[in-house]
Interface confidence: low
């Protein structure tokens, strides 16, 4: 089959990298600078991403493969492939209508993109509050009292606090 | 905000203006630099987010620079010519949602 | 260079009418809808009116309406009163996330 297309389509025999050149009777020739073509038998090259502004190159193009961008320190990508970057707030913040603002009492968001997520409910799983929760960190859940006879563990468990997971702040 | 700084100065010379936030955290909004010369319409200079990165337009790139401390976020221009005499805006917010408060500006004049 | 252009301008209207002012882009602005409308009056700094192509700003009047996608914007202002006299700017946030602002419209009564 192989055989057989190559001969009614020359432009199969292109490798990825080049081009079926119909200007030059389908000689296969290399990509232009700043164009690859990453599968063979293709009659044009396609343009290679540009990288520019917010937008970073993480992996340059070659004459086979596209450039690949990240986003520039202060943003995150958004989209497939990072179509889109954008701006970062800090860890204990999220990104609203009116800029950047604190987690409220009771979320967290340990990245600096993304919205605040609540606390985990210890007692939910019938457990204690290890460590008291932040605007940057989930609360960490211990076992519960009941699990901590004596000599079981040398940790020795926080007074609980007055709603589970909360801290003051 | 109020911007500040603005004055009569030489060609060549350099100025810094600042920016005094009041009443907000800088710690959560983008700050942005704007002008308009006499007559003309608003200009992007470019901004400062959150984290301290900052990003110019293409052609203020080099002679301008923006920078933050607590409260103030400085402007600073090198090599003034006349096309910089112009109102400074100084405005909050990001890209995102716009610019939703601005300073009543500062004038810079370039003149020898 | 990404352009915004404006039209018309300056625009003339009469009290209680509307006028609507458009704004296209020589490429589509980020994620289609980075765009912004501002209203500016001589002697004093721009004023937020719409972000994101069609979202109001708070204590903005209902009266102003953004609308459009990718490279064609429109703000429209219905019910014109006198203190609308202004300059209006369209502000576009592009793929490189560099900022341009329109060359400017000036609505004016008759």
């Known amino acids: 089959f192989e055989r057989t297309r190559s001969l009614q389509d020359p432009c199969s025999n292109c490798p990825a990298g080049t081009f079926c050149d119909n200007n030059r009777n389908q000689i296969c020739s290399p990509c232009p600078p700043n164009s690859f073509s990453s599968a063979g038998g293709q009659r044009t090259c396609d343009i290679c991403r540009q990288c520019k502004g917010v937008f970073r190159t993480r992996k340059e193009c070659s004459s086979t493969s596209n450039a690949e961008c990240d986003c520039t320190p202060g943003f995150h990508c958004l989209g497939a492939g990072c179509s889109m970057c954008e701006q970062d707030c800090k860890q204990g913040q999220e990104l609203t209508k009116k800029g950047c603002k604190d987690c409220c009492f009771g979320t967290f968001n340990d990245q600096k993109r993304g919205i605040c997520r609540p606390w985990t409910n210890c007692s939910l799983d019938g457990k204690s509050v290890l460590v008291n929760g932040t605007k940057e960190r989930d609360v960490v859940c211990g076992p519960s009292p009941a699990d901590l006879s004596p000599g079981a563990s040398s940790v020795t468990p926080p007074a609980p606090a007055r709603e589970p997971g909360h801290s003051p702040q | 905000v109020e911007e500040s700084g603005g004055r009569l100065v030489k060609p060549d010379e350099s100025l810094t203006l600042t920016c005094t936030a009041s009443?907000?955290?800088?710690?959560?909004?983008?700050m942005t630099w704007v002008r308009q010369a006499p007559g003309k319409g608003l200009e992007y200079i470019g901004f400062?987010?959150?984290?301290?990165d900052t990003s110019y337009a293409s052609w203020s790139k080099g002679r301008f620079t923006i920078s933050k401390a607590s409260t103030t976020v400085d402007l600073k221009i090198s090599s003034l010519t006349t096309e910089d005499t112009a109102t400074y805006f100084c405005?909050?917010?990001?890209?995102?949602?716009?610019?939703?408060?601005w300073g009543p500006g500062t004038l810079v004049t370039v003149s020898s | 260079a990404q352009v915004l252009t404006q039209t018309p301008s300056p625009v003339s209207a009469a009290v209680g009418g509307t006028v609507t002012i458009n704004c296209q882009s020589s490429?589509?602005?980020?994620?289609?809808?980075?765009l912004s409308w501002y209203q500016q009056k001589p002697g004093q700094p721009p004023k937020r009116l719409i972000y994101?192509?069609?979202d109001l700003a708070s204590g903005v009047p209902s009266r102003f309406k953004g609308s459009g996608s990718g490279t064609q914007f429109t703000l429209t202002i219905s019910d014109l009163e006198c203190d609308d006299a202004a300059t209006y700017y369209c502000?576009?946030?592009?793929?490189?996330?560099?900022?341009?602002f329109g060359g400017g419209t000036e609505v004016e009564f008759k």
């Open positions: 405005g909050r917010g990001g890209l995102t949602f716009g610019w939703d408060l």
């Open positions: 009443g907000f955290s800088l710690s959560h909004y983008w």
């Open positions: 400062i987010n959150v984290g301290g």
């Open positions: 490429q589509s602005v980020y994620s289609n809808s980075f």
């Open positions: 994101s192509a069609s």
């Open positions: 502000a576009g946030v592009y793929s490189d996330n560099t900022y341009v």
